[in-house]
């Protein structure tokens, strides 16, 4: 019996087609992805093949103005239109709190939404009961396929799930649910979830009875043969893991941003054992036409976005200096504003020991692309912010050793004076450079804001200590020459859309007046 699994993950609000790098589509003839194009391909496969499942491994939420405006209603609407069979919850589905998940998505989706390792307690338990499930038995042709869901247990540190959801260890939570499916004589089981490729592989290895793992969160690109675009494969598709009980378990993921549609064909024997698995992600490029009815629907929903981008978010009573002449040479107040917003966006999990789990931000000055003049009545709009942060990136959470941070700050000024983009703006950090010293030895003082303290204060950076830092995904991926971050980071979790982070902060503060205050000397 043959099953075709079509899968997406980490789509992050890319409802419209995008450029090759998943930013705003400029030249339509070279654009990719989007739900209208995805629908064309999905329908083509559904017509050609008998047993097809369309699955999403989480993080539909967060990433473009679509999510900012529609807050998840757009996800439910267009996933319903594409007739997804099931979705696993990702960490970003909790970005607007539990209510922001329940109302727009859980109550509106026509397909089951899954996670076995999220347990509700207190008053939320009855409110959310039945809106998401640990597993689903999906009838496909004359057979049934069990799907078990899972979500990153780090979600409380990455999003806003509140205090009434407990995120258990994925493997511990999945095993009893898989055992139940086996009891029901469901012998073909897919683990669908959002914990990253390393955890996906562990699930394949450790959870008895799981036949296939369809993952997300780490934006992993797998491919067999010559890759069709810029993404470099992290391994073959499917990636085969040998389980502890000796089975060959295919593990797949489909990069991110709706650029590819994962396509996996699995052949099962009559006892539900995987006989063979093969496939590849399908690049959704312009050779695949956009479905006209979905495209028309997208255009209808678009109207509200254009109106939103010119509305006032808040006011500034000072000039927001985002000029390259400032931000690539010295501390600039636009850099301070953005870093403050980045930290504010990550305020969660205070307890008796920690006032917050992260206090530090770094931001390449070259990523700040425009100032905002306060003389326009002080008004700040989404449009203004899109000029400051035009690349459609995210502000991510990483864990780094102090020694890596020190290298990053040395790199920040290794060729100072040439108006290069690597000069770092900061938050929760005081850095002193001596530019008379030779490159690689210019950081003379590097103090960082404590987190394990009731009164935050600046302490010298410790080389062997592990620190959490918020930074643009561009830096996490080694951009502007920050190879040491990419090579030495201990953990990387993707965060929220950059403009969204700053716009939310400005809306919250209402009036802003960021200063240059001696963070960089």
């Amino acid at each position: 019996w043959e099953l075709t699994i079509l899968h997406t993950n980490d789509v992050h609000s890319r409802l419209e087609q995008t450029s090759e790098d998943s930013s705003k589509c400029v030249n339509a003839s070279r654009c990719m992805g989007g739900v209208a194009r995805l629908f064309t391909k999905v329908q083509q496969i559904r017509r050609a093949e008998p047993n097809v499942l369309l699955l999403d491994a989480g993080d539909q939420y967060q990433g473009t103005i679509w999510f900012t405006v529609y807050k998840g209603a757009e996800v439910a609407h267009f996933m319903n239109a594409l007739r997804y069979d099931a979705m696993a919850l990702g960490n970003h589905e909790f970005d607007n709190g539990v209510e922001g998940l329940i109302e727009p998505l859980l109550k509106e989706a026509k397909f089951p939404i899954l996670s076995a390792n999220i347990k509700a307690k207190g008053p939320l338990a009855s409110q959310i009961s039945g809106l998401y499930l640990p597993y689903k038995v999906l009838p496909v042709g004359d057979e049934v396929v069990g799907i078990v869901g899972y979500t990153s247990k780090e979600t409380p540190f990455l999003s806003n799930p509140g205090t009434n959801l407990v995120f258990e260890d994925e493997i511990t939570a999945l095993q009893p649910e898989v055992d139940k499916l086996k009891t029901l004589n469901v012998n073909k089981i897919i683990a669908l979830g959002h914990s990253g490729f390393e955890t996906d592989k562990l699930i394949a290895q450790k959870v008895r009875g799981v036949d296939v793992v369809v993952g997300g969160h780490s934006n992993t690109f797998l491919y067999t043969g010559n890759p069709p675009s810029k993404e470099v494969p992290a391994g073959k598709y499917p990636f085969i893991v040998t389980s502890d009980d000796g089975r060959k378990v295919p593990v797949v993921q489909a990069y991110a941003f709706g650029k590819y549609l994962g396509y996996l064909k699995i052949e099962f024997d009559e006892r539900g054992n995987v006989i063979s698995s093969h496939g590849n992600p399908i690049l959704l490029n312009s050779s695949i036409p956009e479905d006209p009815s979905i495209k028309a629907d997208i255009n209808k929903w678009r109207i509200k976005l254009d109106n939103y981008s010119t509305q006032e978010l808040g006011k500034t009573i000072v000039y927001l200096d985002g000029s390259s002449q400032s931000c690539r040479f010295r501390e600039c107040n636009m850099g301070n504003l953005i870093c403050d917003a980045m930290i504010n966006n990550n305020l969660r999990h205070a307890d008796e020991m920690f006032w917050n789990h992260v206090s530090m931000c770094i931001l390449n000055g070259g990523g700040i692309r425009s100032p905002i003049d306060e003389r326009n009545n002080g008004t700040i709009t989404w449009e203004n912010l899109a000029a400051v942060l035009p690349f459609g990136g995210t502000f991510d959470l990483v864990q780094l050793k102090g020694s890596t941070l020190k290298k990053a700050f040395e790199h920040s000024v290794h060729r100072y004076g040439q108006s290069t983009g690597e000069f770092l703006q900061v938050g929760g950090i005081h850095v002193v450079y001596d530019l008379s010293r030779k490159p690689g030895d210019r950081v003379v003082k590097l103090d960082v804001l404590c987190t394990k303290c009731r009164v935050p204060s600046y302490d010298p950076l410790k080389m062997d200590e592990i620190y959490k830092v918020i930074l643009p995904n561009f830096l996490a991926n080694g951009g502007d020459g920050f190879q040491m971050i990419k090579d030495e980071l201990l953990r990387h979790d993707s965060g929220d859309q950059d403009i969204n982070v700053v716009s939310t902060y400005i809306s919250k503060m209402k009036v802003i007046y960021p200063a240059v205050e001696g963070r960089i000397k």
Epitope: A109, K110, P112, P134, K136, L138, P139, V140, L184
Partner: antibody, heavy 119, light 107 residues
Framework: QVQLQQSGAEVKKPGASVKVSCKAS????????IYWVRQRPGQGLEWIGW????????KYNEKFKGRATLTADTSASTAYMELSSLTSEDTAVYYC????????????WGQGTLVTVSS | DIQLTQSPSFLSASVGDRVTITCKAS??????VAWYQQKPGQSPKLLIY???TRHTGVPDRFSGSGSGTEFTLTISSLQPEDFATYYC?????????FGQGTKVEIK
Amino acid sequence: QVQLQQSGAEVKKPGASVKVSCKASGYTFTRYYIYWVRQRPGQGLEWIGWIYPGNFNTKYNEKFKGRATLTADTSASTAYMELSSLTSEDTAVYYCARDVYDYAGFAYWGQGTLVTVSS
Amino acid sequence: DIQLTQSPSFLSASVGDRVTITCKASQGVATAVAWYQQKPGQSPKLLIYWASTRHTGVPDRFSGSGSGTEFTLTISSLQPEDFATYYCQQYSSYPWTFGQGTKVEIK
């Protein structure tokens, strides 16, 4: 809250067919199986089959295969059970039901529809 | 088909009594067993699923146990509203089947 509202009682002649409806409310219809169970007068319960409104797949108890047809109208959030070639043995209360977790017990029941087959 | 045999078929008990109903399966069904309560003229109500998990809103005097072929439903202290017929059901193998029922009457 989850509710399943069934159509009213029916009296049918032997050899005829009957179609019982079950309107669901209080939840997303396409996300849960609808099960059909019958209970003959003074007897126990008998499972007829299920339909998954998400993709209209069905499963029948072999005893009813060929005579029972399960369908669903997602736009009306309504499931239907049609039973053909009726005999007096089919006189029973017919229930639709829904689960909490797939297959694992019928948590929500309709009020039942009495079908009487009599010449 | 898997046969489920409940015992006893009838049971007379008083308020406050501890009542145990057993359900034997003709072949193993692991823990894929549910228990229902039905009162005359009403639809059945789910009490227990997965052999021992109480359904939402079911009083904790009701408990289920067992696996494989032998299952029990226990009412720790019988209340006036508990007089009804109780059915077990297996959902491990098709066709899903029910026990013949146990009627709990007032002594």
